[in-house]
Interface confidence: medium
């Protein structure tokens, strides 16, 4: 399977909310022995590999923001902790999963990564991730609402196997 990032760049005004999205593509094994762990974190564009370093989002680690379920099941974070930080991650039946960030500030600008780990118990773990940029702007040059820029077909699939 692969992870697609429909949008590679989100440009938002300060104070706005934004939902960053990733999509699971390809055959998804719905077997009893297969579960999916999905999460989000901030990173930097490393020289070797994007999304290698895992930094917190608003002081919440990737462990705090995880979703964990089988196949294309729906799930969302009910963590009070996440919601207190204006964050919520969610997943639907169609392979889409997202993180919503409320009341954006300039400090939220940066590179965001979604991570999916397919866990085949007794056998292996397979990792894929996607990357996207968030730019929060202020002042007269800022858009009135978030503007999203689609990924090129080449960029929209970020594949990292483990």
């Amino acid at each position: 399977f692969k992870v697609a990032t429909p949008y590679s760049l989100y440009v938002c005004p300060e104070g706005q909310n934004v939902t960053l999205t990733c999509r699971l593509l390809g055959p998804v094994d719905k077997g009893h022995d297969v579960t999916f762990y999905k999460t989000w974190y901030r990173s930097s564009r490393g020289e070797v590999q994007t999304c290698s370093e895992r930094r917190p989002i608003r002081n919440l680690t990737f462990q705090d923001l995880h979703l964990h379920h089988g196949g294309h099941q729906a799930a969302n974070t009910s963590h009070d902790l996440a919601q207190r930080h204006g964050l919520e991650s969610a997943s639907d039946h169609h392979g889409n999963f997202s993180i919503t960030m409320r009341n954006l500030t300039l400090l939220d600008s940066g590179l965001y990564c979604c991570l999916v780990v397919e866990i085949r118990h007794h056998h292996s773990e397979h990792r894929v991730h996607g990357a996207m940029e968030l730019q929060v702007q202020t002042g007269k040059d800022a858009p009135s609402n978030c503007v999203v820029y689609p990924s090129s077909s080449q960029d929209s699939e970020n594949i990292t196997a483990a």
Epitope: D33, T35, Y37, V48, S52, R54, F62, Q63, D64, H66, H68, H79, L115, V117, I119, H121, H122, H123, S124, E125, R127, A161, A162
Partner: antibody
Framework: EVQLQQSGPELVKPGASMKISCKAS????????MNWVKQSHGKNLEWIGL????????SYNQKFKGKATLTVDKSSSTAYMELLSLTSEDSAVYYC???????????WGQGTSVTVSS | QIVLTQSPAIMSASPGEKVTMTCSAS?????MFWYQQKPGSSPRLLIY???NLASGVPLRFSGSGSGTSYSLTISRMEAEDAATYYC?????????FGSGTKLEIK
């Protein structure tokens, strides 16, 4: 603060069985796997297996199948490892450690020393 | 199973000296992880995903490598770095550790 508190040292007789506990606090227990590691003579580390508190799923190192049984009690956020039919080869320090999927064992218990002797 | 071979088994270094130890895998792995263990203590995560420092790890530590060959480097040895270092892989079951490199201070 993340903590993994293991039960105390054990002296057991050959052929007996015993259970080690690992109480987790300071994090979401179901968001991690609980892993168990054996360290013999203060040297090599061996991965015994893991259990997912999320769904009770287990994965074992084939070497420890039939020797170790992993369970969890979600209500008390405690992981257990039962060691069966003990021999002197099982004398070691056993660690529990939490691991997020796609990551590493970032917090470890203090270790439980098991001595098998008649 | 994937066998991880660490070398050297034992080494010593003077304060300020650069230290490099290696971990060789019997089959290709995607990422390597490194742990530090001092006598009487539990292992401590040092490096994840081959080259990223875990929280609180000093910047003098670094990791690199790919495929079957990985290394851990300490740019300037300090007395508190005396410990045993283990590499570990999560690429395939069973997850395995290296045999360890014991680093002593001169």
């Amino acid at each position: 603060e993340v903590q993994l508190q293991q039960s105390g040292p054990e002296l057991v007789k050959p052929g007996a069985s015993m259970k080690i506990s690992c109480k987790a606090s300071g994090f979401s227990f179901t968001g991690y796997t609980m892993n168990w590691v054996k360290q013999s003579h203060g040297k090599n580390l061996e991965w015994i297996g893991l259990i997912s508190p999320y769904n009770g799923g287990t994965s074992y190192n084939q070497k420890f199948k039939g020797k170790a049984t992993l369970t969890v009690d979600k209500s008390s956020s405690t992981a257990y490892m039962e060691l069966l039919s003990l021999t002197s080869e099982d004398s070691a320090v056993y660690y529990c450690a939490r691991r997020a999927y796609g990551y590493a064992m970032d917090y470890w218990g203090q270790g439980t020393s098991v001595t098998v002797s008649s | 199973q994937i066998v991880l071979t660490q070398s050297p088994a034992i080494m010593s270094a003077s304060p300020g000296e650069k230290v490099t130890m290696t971990c060789s895998a019997s089959s290709s792995v995607s990422y390597m992880f490194w742990y530090q263990q001092k006598p009487g203590s539990s292992p401590r995560l040092l490096i994840y995903d081959t080259s990223n420092l875990a929280s609180g790890v000093p910047l003098r530590f670094s990791g690199s490598g790919s495929g079957t060959s990985y290394s851990l480097t300490i740019s300037r040895m300090e007395a508190e770095d005396a410990a045993t270092y283990y590499c570990q892989q999560w690429s395939s079951y069973p997850f395995t550790f290296g045999s360890g490199t014991k680093l002593e201070i001169k």
